[in-house]
């Protein structure tokens, strides 16, 4: 197991998850850790505890390894980091990778007030309700935006969007969370259509690949609950 020595360390590796950082309960996920060509061992940590290791074969000169989680559950949802060793030195820790399990327990209801088709500039509020009491609700927009909003609430939360712009149009879903990394089933999608303005088009952007499997978000939220602009479709945490 890795020994902490702060004196001499190698650059931190990059960690990411495929196909997504949001994984349906029971499904598999790959966690990739990219270090150096010379790495002799990679170690994966989960919530600060040693989780897995891989020793690349010398014959295969690779600078990354894949850790496979065969069945995602609430017990494997949380924060992952990785390290690598080259010679006698260990790297610094990668940035944290936050894996969320979805598809737990119950399905929330999502609706929009005053209606799903509104005029540019109109005030819109999303409501998410879940019979099972949860601590927090998340509202996510498919594609087109990397913003997640979260609100605390017992069985219902409201998400005021303010006066809407064309950027607000699209398809939304909400989740109830039992903790930050264990979420309910997704709600049925609600598509917000914006009419009026110069480009008079009420069509929401269509994308054949737009589905939960293609969502990627960095789940760090600021105090207001609105996500910082730091999502990548490959969820590569690097900086």
């Amino acid at each position: 197991q890795r020994i902490n020595t702060e004196k001499e360390t190698l650059p931190k590796p990059i960690i990411w998850a495929k196909p997504s950082i949001m994984v349906t309960n029971g499904n598999s996920v790959n966690i990739w850790c990219q270090g150096a060509q010379s790495a002799s061992e990679y170690q994966l940590y989960f919530e600060g505890s040693f989780f897995a290791l891989e020793r690349p074969k010398p014959s295969r000169s690779m600078n990354k390894v894949r850790f496979f989680i065969s069945q995602m559950t609430s017990h494997t949802a949380g924060i992952y980091t990785c390290f690598y060793q080259s010679g006698e030195l260990w790297s610094k820790s990668s940035n944290p990778l936050k894996l969320v399990v979805t598809g737990l327990y119950d399905t929330p209801n999502l609706w929009v007030y005053p209606r799903p088709e509104v005029t540019l500039g109109e005030n819109v509020t999303f409501f998410c309700q879940l019979k099972t009491a949860t601590s927090k609700f998340f509202l996510l927009k498919e594609r087109g935006s990397n913003h997640i909003q979260n609100k605390y609430g017992n069985i219902q939360a409201e998400f005021p969007m303010g006066p809407v712009t064309r950027a607000h149009r699209g398809t939304y879903r909400c989740f109830g969370s039992y903790n930050d990394y264990a979420w309910s089933f997704p709600s049925e999608p609600v598509t917000l259509l914006i009419t009026g303005g110069v480009e008079n088009s009420s069509l929401a952007p269509t994308d054949p690949t737009s589905s939960l499997d293609y969502w990627e978000f960095d789940l760090s939220t600021n105090e207001s609950g609105l996500q910082k602009d730091s999502a990548f479709w490959d969820h590569t945490t690097q900086n």
Partner: nanobody, 127 residues
Amino acid sequence: EVQLVESGGGEVQPGGSLRLSCAASGRTFASAAMGWFRQAPGKEREFVAAISRSVDDTYYADSVKGRFTISRDNAKNTVYLQMSSLRAEDTAVYYCAAVVPTYGNNIYVHSAAYNYWGQGTLVTVKP
């Protein structure tokens, strides 16, 4: 579906040896990473040893390093734990576990990674 059945437990004197076996049913054994865990009375389950699916990579808890050896026979769908120089503190129920499927040479140390577990076999070390 994978079923794991441990055997080989029993009572042994300090300094003695035992070999535990874990027989796996199903055709997926060759693609499974395997591990041994143990749980002493009143304590949490702890990692003992693990082996990658390709046989040639192993990892041990510091407490058993140099005394225990994990191995596997993919032809027999069996993983083994050879235990020697046994101590009183090795007394526990020993569980075999599998990660099915897996890739590469992943070795899993954390119990949460394992998706199949055996019922356990009791090892008692006493004079």
